[in-house]
């Protein structure tokens, strides 16, 4: 049958629309299904019917149940059912699955999170937004009309977002909260000729003899998952593994994703107990993918 699930929290406002939509001029009668008792239309009641809307101001756990709406046109009567569940407020931050609205996905280009069901309420901006129960602060977050916009979306923006607003009915204010999950999806990936972010080509780095130093080779290869992308160091044109000097070690390349979505790799060359002969070597940062090879050279000099 034409039925819709609705849910809310005790002591908050809940407004439910009849699932059987009709033209605005049609009369709508509401009943509590278990008793077939008519829902009053007088606004002085805590629970009252207002056309296509059923209002709980505020809701109580005991209001849970199935409500019948009958929409009457001059020649047709059509029935809908609203299955309402009111839950006790959660003592902790955790929002259980049964209180979650549909999950939305976002990406770098589109990161709107709409506040669920808000169109049913008489509310005024701005909305308050929370992520995993923490109030959202900072310039990346913009509460705009009935949605939240996140600038420069990153994967760690995924999580549960709660909107909180005030519903006003005849001068009385009621709180409403609604939570939905937000997931971040990768934009369509692509690969580019490698771009080395560091070091600059023909750079010179000053070092202290006898000290340790690190050289970082950082290169980006495009967006999204990359089929082939390697970053490595060479000494005088030779692989580190072929250069028999235990003081000089190359770390495994670390994948890194920046807020702009670029797929980058960092590889660190660690030189322990810098010696005079290390200043004579040519250190090449190599970035390789299917498009080709890019090389930046760096040398060491005494401080």
């Amino acid at each position: 049958k034409f039925s819709k699930q609705s849910w809310g929290l005790e002591n908050e406002a809940l407004i439910v629309r009849c699932p059987r939509q009709g033209k605005s001029s049609y009369i709508v009668d509401w009943y509590y299904s278990q008793t077939n008792k008519s829902i009053p239309t007088q606004e002085r009641n805590r629970v009252f019917a207002s056309g296509q809307l059923l209002k709980f101001l505020p809701a109580e756990v005991a209001d849970s149940g199935i409500y019948t709406c009958i929409v009457r046109s001059p020649t047709f009567n059509r029935t809908g059912y609203a299955n309402v569940t009111i839950y006790k407020k959660q003592p902790d931050c955790n929002v259980p699955d049964y209180l979650m609205y549909s999950t939305v996905s976002g990406s770098e280009k589109n990161s709107k999170i709409y506040c669920p069901t808000i169109d049913l309420y008489n509310w005024t901006a701005p909305l308050e937004w929370f992520k995993n129960c923490q109030a959202l602060q900072g310039s990346r977050y913009k509460a705009h009309k009935s949605f939240l916009v996140i600038d420069n979306v990153m994967t760690d923006d995924a999580g549960d977002y709660t909107c909180k607003f005030i519903h006003n009915e005849n001068g009385a204010n009621y709180s409403v909260t609604a939570t939905r999950s937000f997931t971040v999806k990768d934009e369509q990936g692509f690969s580019l000729f490698p771009v080395i972010r560091a070091p600059a080509h023909n750079e010179t780095k000053e070092v202290e003899i006898g000290e340790n130093t690190n050289l970082t080779c950082s290169a980006c290869f495009g967006k999204g998952a990359q089929f082939l992308a390697t970053v490595q160091w060479q000494l005088n044109g030779n692989k580190i593994t072929d250069f028999s000097e235990p003081r000089i070690q190359q770390e495994e390349g670390q994948n890194q994703s920046f807020s702009n979505g670029l797929a980058c790799v960092n590889t660190v060359l660690r030189i322990a107990d810098v010696k005079e002969e290390d200043l004579l070597l040519r250190y090449d940062c190599l970035a390789l993918n299917l498009h080709g090879l890019r090389r930046h050279t760096i040398r060491l000099s005494r401080k």
């Epitope: 049958k1 034409f2 939509q21 009709g22 033209k23 046109s73 020649t75 047709f76 059509r78 029935t79």
Partner: antibody, heavy 123, light 107 residues
Framework: EVQLLESGGGLVQPGGSLRLSCAAS????????MIWVRQAPGKGLEWVST????????SYADSVKGRFTISRDNSKNTLYLQMNSLRAEDTAVYYC????????????????WGQGTLVTVSS | EIVLTQSPATLSLSPGERATLSCRAS??????LAWYQQKPGQAPRLLIY???NRATGIPARFSGSGSGTDFTLTISSLEPEDFAVYYC?????????FGQGTKVEIK
């Protein structure tokens, strides 16, 4: 009393054009969705096209898309179906009908129908 | 599109007998299903809407039942004027589709 009266049917050659009209009376025409349904001789009913009352949005069956155009003139309480590039398989009785309920994006039954007008496509 | 299959194609019965017509949808239409009656040379006439509600002016001998994919139109006791073709129609989604019809004829 609600009445729908189709006109404009007739014999037309393949590739030709025809414009059907449906004059409505007895109800507030402008707020209702209106529909064309056709019935080939000895066959069943086939939805052809819908035009919304509020907003005037249109939709078409795949079999007529790009060839037929539904329109309405609310000031004249009249529904139209412009049929171009007619084919033999378009031969049918064309009925206009009223959807008494539907809201944007939804559909309902057809509670009033005209008596139909016969379109014959033949060389 | 949603395909509606009606059975039987023809039903041969005598006045006073009970007629049971079936309509099966290729996917769920909830209760968004209607039944129409059509007599030769006439336009269809709405009998049942929302699967089980009688339209205004339709005699109580016509009843509809079902939900989801299986629906039934029952005429409890056939009157002479009930011999006609009956169509089911779904309106849950575009395009609106009709069944191919069941002809109820006099035995």
């Amino acid at each position: 009393e609600v009445q729908l009266l189709e006109s404009g049917g007739g014999l037309v050659q393949p590739g030709g054009s025809l414009r059907l009209s449906c004059a409505a009376s007895g109800f507030t025409f402008s707020i209702y969705d209106m529909i064309w349904v056709r019935q080939a001789p000895g066959k069943g009913l086939e939805w052809v096209s819908t035009i919304r009352g509020e907003g005037g949005g249109t939709s078409y069956a795949d079999s007529v898309k790009g060839r037929f155009t539904i329109s309405r003139d609310n000031s004249k309480n009249t529904l139209y179906l412009q049929m171009n590039s007619l084919r033999a398989e378009d031969t049918a009785v064309y009925y206009c009908a009223r959807d008494p309920w539907s809201t944007e994006g939804s559909f309902f039954v057809l509670d009033y129908w005209g008596q139909g007008t016969l379109v014959t496509v033949s060389s | 599109e949603i395909v509606l299959t009606q059975s039987p194609a023809t039903l041969s019965l005598s006045p006073g007998e009970r007629a049971t017509l079936s309509c099966r949808a290729s996917q769920s239409v909830d209760d968004d299903l209607a039944w129409y009656q059509q007599k030769p040379g006439q336009a269809p006439r709405l009998l049942i809407y929302d699967a089980s509600n009688r339209a205004t002016g339709i005699p109580a001998r016509f009843s509809g039942s079902g939900s989801g994919t299986d629906f039934t139109l029952t005429i409890s006791s056939l009157e002479p004027e009930d011999f006609a073709v009956y169509y089911c129609q779904q309106y849950i989604t575009a395009p609106l589709t009709f069944g191919q019809g069941t002809k109820v004829e006099i035995k």
